[in-house]
């Protein structure tokens, strides 16, 4: 058989091979397509078939205009004029070229070592649904899971059978890496002698991360002054994309805790006392240090705040200006 | 709103002739395949014509295959049914409806027509 | 040509009941029938195309089905308004052939 592929609502002609041009013809046009349920038997005379597959004068079948229903397979069986029966066997396919694609919500910068989402390409109308590939700097970016990351999304018109792609990029630029990325998306139907359709190119800024604006070190109760049995609980509140990791130091050392950015201080007693703070560490700007809290453990109605422990303000915040 | 309206119906003697016609709107006519259905009196239905959207095909039942010419002008949205050498079986009411491909299954139908051919 | 037997040619029933009408086709015409609806003294209304599929703007109690070339048109729970004539009708093939009809009153 012949693979024919026919663009949606164009006309399309398939030749009975063998038949006489002129009748009288000997000859049987038979379909099975979306529009039958087994083989079905097209009239010599014509009828309410025609206006979707007519047997045209010279024995061709004419379809008008194809459409999603038409796909299947089409045969004809004719007796040629030497009485030899000659068959012709066609598969058809039909597709749709859909508009341009197009980015949308495109980012308008990246920012290096953290996920950034590029935009959304969209193509509506493709018959059947092709697929969407992003190119980076001309080259085909294959998505790995972790640095390129591809959300894809096929929706079908109920009405029409057409179908619409959306293909949502996001990304982890690589620091030090291209400076100014340029993205583009292309929509391929996959089929032979069909070039992809590109988007126009998005060109965008790779920021690197800037280190913390600054460290703040959030001790509550207020003044960090508690009774015992109290609980004391101690924010380190830091400004940076990705968050750092957070290690905390009493007295100048390291405590041995898992990192966060969370020190929970319960039922305290003497043995907490001491100075508090905590240790960012931003993969590309090294550590940096709050300045330090004082935590005393005293009966209220003690004296004052201690001294390095939060004064005036009242809002037992301590802020290091980078 | 899709409207179908025939006319030109009436009483006429056996083997004389008769036009009805079917003015629509609300849709666009030209895309549709055309139908013209009768009725007999205390009868059934009875296809009598169809014409393809272009009015390049016809179709008819050996019943009036020869005596009547289904037409359309789609520049003035107007379907025609020209009746010769009428017949005493052809008394009906004569409906204009659209479709008769597989596509169009006779969604809309006119109001209908009474042709009665009686000497 | 094809032939439609319609049956019955009439029935006579209660308000609320279910009622199934049927057409049987004399070859195979797949898909492509209608049923229409006919009140007296107005032109027929199209309830069911291509055998299954509900015409917009009627009730959910009509339905239509196919087993082989046996096509039926049920109205279940029939209320007044439904009191009229039925016709089936094959458009696969020339010449198109309507059904005899079934008309329905209530008892």
């Known amino acids: 058989g012949q693979n024919i592929t026919a663009r949606i609502g164009e006309p399309l002609v398939l030749s009975c091979k063998g038949a006489p041009k002129k009748p009288p013809q000997q000859l049987e046009w038979k379909l099975n397509t979306g529009r039958t349920e087994a083989w079905k038997v097209l009239s010599p005379q014509g009828g309410p078939w025609d206006s979707v597959a007519q047997i045209l004068p010279n024995g061709s079948l004419l379809l008008p205009a194809t459409g999603i229903v038409d796909e299947g397979t089409f045969r004809c069986r004719a007796t040629n004029r030497r009485g030899k029966e000659v068959k012709s066997n066609y598969r058809v396919r039909v597709y749709q070229i859909p508009g341009k694609p197009e980015i949308v919500d495109p980012a308008s910068e990246l920012t290096a070592s953290v996920p950034n989402k590029v935009g959304t390409c969209v193509s509506e109308g493709s018959y059947p649904a092709g697929t969407l590939s992003w190119h980076l700097d001309g080259k085909l970016l294959i998505p790995d899971g972790k640095e390129t990351l591809v959300k894809e999304e096929t929706r079908r018109h109920p009405e029409t059978g057409l179908f619409t792609l959306r293909s949502e990029l996001t990304v982890i630029p690589t620091q030090g890496g291209t400076t100014h990325p340029t993205f583009s998306c292309s929509f391929s139907l996959g089929l032979p002698r069909r070039r992809p359709l590109n988007t126009a190119p998005i060109q965008l800024r790779v920021r690197e991360p800037g280190p913390p604006e600054g460290i703040q070190l959030l001790v509550e109760p207020e003044g960090g002054i508690v009774a015992p049995g109290g609980t004391v609980t101690l924010t380190c509140a830091i400004s940076a994309q990705p968050p750092p990791q957070v290690h905390w130091i009493k007295d100048g050392a390291p405590l041995p805790l898992a990192p966060s950015p969370v020190l929970l201080l319960p039922e305290v007693g003497h043995a907490d006392e001491g100075t508090y703070s905590c240790v960012a560490t931003h993969p590309s700007h090294g550590p940096q240090e709050s300045p330090p809290v004082s935590i005393r453990v005293t009966e209220t109605g003690d004296e004052g705040p201690a001294e390095g422990s939060v004064g005036e303000s009242g809002l037992g915040t301590l802020a290091l200006a980078l | 709103e899709v409207q179908l309206v025939e006319s030109g119906g009436g009483l006429v003697q056996p083997g004389r002739s008769l036009k009805l016609s079917c003015v629509v709107s609300?849709?666009?006519?030209?895309?549709?395949?055309m139908t013209w259905i009768r009725q007999t009196p205390g009868k059934g239905l009875e296809w009598v014509a169809s014409i393809n959207n272009s009015g390049d095909n016809t179709y008819y039942p050996d019943s009036v295959k020869d005596r009547f010419t289904i037409s359309r002008d789609n520049a003035k949205s107007t379907l025609y049914l020209q009746m010769n050498s009428l017949r005493s079986e052809d008394t009906a009411t004569y409906y204009c409806t659209r479709g008769g491909d597989i596509t169009t299954g006779f969604d809309y139908w006119g109001q209908g027509v009474m042709v009665t051919v009686s000497s | 040509d094809i032939q439609m037997t319609q049956s019955p040619s009439s029935m006579s029933v209660s308000l609320g009941d279910t009622i199934t009408i049927t057409c049987r086709a004399s070859q195979d015409v797949g898909i492509y029938v209608n049923w229409f609806q006919q009140k007296p003294g107005k032109s027929p209304r199209r309830m069911i195309y291509?055998?299954?599929n509900l015409a917009d703007g009627v009730p959910s109690r009509f339905s239509g089905s196919r087993s082989g070339s046996i096509y039926s048109l049920t109205i279940s729970s029939l209320e007044s308004e439904d009191v009229a004539d039925y016709h089936c009708l094959e458009f696969d093939e020339h010449p198109l052939t309507f059904g005899s009809g079934t008309k329905v009153e209530i008892k």
């Open positions: 609300g849709f666009t006519f030209n895309n549709y395949w």
């Open positions: 291509r055998a299954t």
